[in-house]
Interface confidence: low
């Protein structure tokens, strides 16, 4: 079967059930439903999934049976619209059910909530989890899929199956270990952190497709795959880009069965053709399907062919540049991006896209000029400042990170970003700035050649979190502007923002700075978040506070927490010393 060249099927649901198998079919339908109806109880979703599965089985037995010819959107949408409490739980989302496909599915997609009002997932004791795992493994794993999917409505579904497989493996191994906790907890921490990162990366892909269109996503994919597979010819890269775009369009559009099926086909194609793609794929291609797909997605860049010829010959010196550009603009720009990216694994994808955009803009201008060649002859000179800007920024920030360490580096970013966009909610500023700060430990350890792709492409993912959270409740025109004007210039746009002089400082509220003994029982991470929340609030009250003033207040605050957590009567200490701290802080900041 050629990749994505399928015969017409009488029953799409039967076709996908047969392709994916019952286990994956059920898991993917559960993910799809949980990503759409994020507030529904687990048991309700399981019931819906079982009903859909039984129906699919009847269609496998007889593809001509009643309703088997309906599209998956129709079948799944009809099923979601049977939920009795739709209006009470989801409000206007219930209006989607009055629409016909494809508008109904589009309506459901628009109501996906990136920040659903759901309780924080609390990890039970290890023995409790192991008992639950042994009592009913299937339900335990379904619950994992459900809880992740409803909190991350754009999580890449086939990748979530891979996470679930690792989750199961962790419990299978560790629940029979001598020290269950020592075995299991690090594995769960790793899965949690990797899962959050995977969710954020996929969210950017979906934002790219949904907000900026297929062309933007394809450009990103050409650049990234050309870096990863520099020996693959342009046609091969382009084919992979076309297929990858289809996969992600499907997943971002809620077509999870098609997405998972097509991702499996793409992995199969890549492995069958690895000789013409990359020498780094051999190990990946020996793995089972889910591991194989994950491995391919994360595979290291192949070695660049040595001494590739100068780009100038085809893209600057050739007299046919404008003719070729006019004949097939996207192909020509795609070739430019491919050729540039395969030569520059040391550049971030967003930088490569900025260079391609500059090249495109220059050709648009110059190919209409009297002497096109004279006009575009110096186009590569325009690239220099674009390359130097992220290089310098990364150098400065890595130096700062190395001086301060992660926590204090995050605090510096908290202050910086709160001053830029003080209207943004404190939890969002804390979450985004903490993640921005993680760029230090993630990327600064790398040699120069790997720093920029690591740092700037990671920052794109984090800033997209800010953009999607802000889109839900827009409060800052500056954030809206940076998020919507250009996908590839988001980071430079935020970097260029200065202190918002129009911001009216927040009224001082002592309650914001009142702390209790419960802070002493928090983990180090949660304690940091409390302190960082206070820091953001301080800046919102006093945007013109200097670094020194803020540092003094934060040092006093840290000492206050440490002192009271050691006290016999912690609560009294927090009450009395807290009042003193608030007064001293107000005085220090001139509030």
């Amino acid at each position: 079967r050629g990749v994505f060249r399928r015969d017409a099927h009488k029953s799409e649901v039967a076709h996908r059930f047969k392709d994916l198998g019952e286990e994956n079919f059920k898991a993917l339908v559960l993910i799809a439903f949980a990503q759409y109806l994020q507030q529904c109880p687990f048991e309700d979703h399981v019931k819906l999934v079982n009903e859909v599965t039984e129906f699919a089985k009847t269609c496998v037995a007889d593809e001509s049976a009643e309703n088997c010819d309906k599209s998956l959107h129709t079948l799944f949408g009809d099923k979601l619209c049977t939920v009795a409490t739709l209006r009470e739980t989801y409000g206007e989302m219930a209006d989607c059910c009055a629409k016909q496909e494809p508008e109904r599915n589009e309506c459901f997609l628009q109501h996906k909530d990136d920040n659903p009002n759901l309780p924080r997932l609390v990890r039970p004791e290890v023995d409790v989890m192991c008992t639950a795992f042994h009592d009913n493994e299937e339900t335990f794993l379904k619950k994992y899929l459900y809880e992740i999917a409803r909190r991350h409505p754009y999580f890449y579904a086939p990748e979530l199956l891979f996470f679930a497989k690792r989750y199961k493996a962790a419990f299978t191994e560790c629940c029979q270990a001598a020290d269950k906790a020592a075995c299991l907890l690090p594995k769960l921490d790793e899965l949690r952190d990797e899962g959050k990162a995977s969710s954020a990366k996929q969210r950017l892909k979906c934002a790219s497709l949904q907000k900026f269109g297929e062309r933007a996503f394809k450009a990103w994919a050409v650049a990234r795959l050309s870096q990863r597979f520099p020996k693959a010819e342009f046609a091969e890269v382009s084919k992979l880009v076309t297929d990858l775009t289809k996969v992600h369009t499907e997943c971002c559009h809620g077509d999870l069965l098609e997405c998972a099926d097509d991702r499996a086909d793409l992995a199969k194609y890549i492995c069958e053709n690895q000789d013409s793609i990359s020498s780094k794929l051999k190990e990946c291609c020996e793995k089972p399907l889910l591991e194989k797909s994950h491995c391919i997605a994360e595979v290291e860049n192949d070695e660049m062919p040595a001494d590739l010829p100068s780009l100038a010959a085809d893209f600057v010196e050739s007299k046919d540049v404008c003719k070729n550009y006019a004949e097939a603009k996207d192909v020509f720009l795609g070739m430019f991006l491919y050729e540039y990216a395969r030569r520059h694994p040391d550049y971030s994808v967003v930088l490569l896209l900025r260079l391609a955009k500059t090249y495109e803009t220059t050709l648009e201008k110059c190919c209409a000029a009297a002497d096109p060649h004279e006009c575009y002859a110096k186009v590569f000179d325009e690239f220099k400042p674009l390359v130097e800007e992220p290089q310098n920024l990364i150098k400065q920030n890595c130096e700062l990170f190395e001086q301060l360490g992660e926590y204090k580096f995050q605090n510096a970013l908290l202050v910086r970003y709160t001053k830029k966009v003080p209207q943004v909610s404190t939890p969002t500023l804390v979450e985004v700035s903490r993640n921005l700060g993680k760029v230090g430990s993630k990327c600064c350890k790398h040699p120069e050649a790997k720093r920029m792709p690591c740092a700037e492409d990671y920052l794109s993912v984090v800033l997209n979190q800010l953009c999607v959270l802000h889109e839900k409740t827009p409060v800052s025109d500056r954030v809206t502007k940076c998020c919507t004007e250009s996908l590839v210039n988001r980071r430079p746009c935020f970097s260029a923002l200065e202190v918002d002089e129009t911001y009216v400082p927040k009224e001082f509220n002592a309650e914001t700075f009142t702390f209790h003994a419960d802070i002493c029982t928090l983990s180090e991470k949660e304690r940091q978040i409390k302190k960082q929340t206070a820091l953001v609030e301080l800046v919102k009250h006093k945007p013109k506070a200097t670094k020194e003033q803020l540092k003094a207040v934060m040092d006093d605050f840290a000492a206050f927490v440490e002192k009271c957590c050691k006290a016999d009567d912690k609560e009294t200490c927090f009450a009395e010393e807290g009042k003193k701290l608030v007064a001293a802080s107000q005085a220090a900041l001139g509030l």
Partner: antibody, heavy 119, light 111 residues
Framework: EVQLVQSGAEVKKPGESLKISCKGS????????IGWVRQMPGKGLEWMGI????????RYSPSFEGQVTISADKSISTAYLQWSSLKASDTAAYYC????????????WGQGTLVTVSS | QSALTQPASVSGSPGQSITISCSGI?????????VSWYQQYPGKAPKLIIY???KRPSGVSNRFSGSKSGNTASLTISGLQADDEAEYSC???????????FGGGTQLTVL
């Protein structure tokens, strides 16, 4: 100056083995694919296969798979085409070409090696 | 049996224009313009004259031009000259095994 220089003409008997060569100079030999092309008397050109000397990644056109072996020695910038057992139908001119960018674009060619197989 | 189809021969008088067609270009090769044209004199090696459908390598006369429509590529030679008499072959990306294919070749005769 980029050059591809092929070994001289060969006259062989059916069943004999043969290895012809193509030496590249004037460019980084490991950076470009090398393709081999057959042209039987009075006939058109046929791509036989390609090799990337940098890592000896080799691919064959379906009709030549198993019939010939393509190899390269990057230490002496030379690509090879060999037969383990020649047939009369292997009589042809064989060309090597440097492939630039995509595999359908041969920008520099060897002068050709004429192979005659006759009993 | 070539995957690309060319007329066996074409002819034209000096100064005229002629066009040689090459049909059977795969959709993949077509969408990314992966078609080349070669000129070959008897007993000599082929010479690249057009690549990526329309591009001419440096040193190739601008009388040679390439184009494509659907799954057919074309080579046009304008202002025909006596020394254009040669065999012309198209070549294109063949798909998954990543080895190109040639057309059967077209003999151009300048009358």
């Amino acid at each position: 100056e980029v050059q591809l220089v092929q070994s001289g003409a060969e006259v062989k008997k059916p069943g004999e083995s043969l290895k012809i060569s193509c030496k590249g100079s004037g460019y980084s030999f490991t950076s470009y694919w090398i393709g081999w092309v057959r042209q039987m008397p009075g006939k058109g050109l046929e791509w036989m296969g390609i090799i990337y000397p940098g890592d000896s990644d080799t691919r064959y056109s379906p009709s030549f798979e198993g019939q010939v072996t393509i190899s390269a020695d990057k230490s002496i910038s030379t690509a090879y085409l060999q037969w383990s057992s020649l047939k009369a139908s292997d009589t042809a001119a064989y060309y090597c070409a440097r492939l630039h960018g995509v595999v359908s674009r041969g920008d520099y060619w060897g002068q050709g090696t004429l192979v005659t197989v006759s009993s | 049996q070539s995957a690309l189809t060319q007329p066996a021969s074409v002819s034209g008088s000096p100064g005229q224009s002629i066009t040689i067609s090459c049909s059977g270009i795969s959709s993949l090769a077509g969408s990314y313009n992966l078609v080349s044209w070669y000129q070959q004199y008897p007993g000599k090696a082929p010479k690249l004259i057009i690549y990526e459908v329309t591009k001419r390598p440096s040193g190739v006369s601008n009388r040679f031009s390439g184009s494509k429509s659907g799954n057919t590529a074309s080579l046009t030679i304008s202002g025909l000259q006596a020394d254009d008499e040669a065999e012309y072959s198209c070549s294109s990306y063949a798909g998954r095994n990543a080895v190109a294919v040639f057309g059967g070749g077209t003999q151009l005769t300048v009358l």
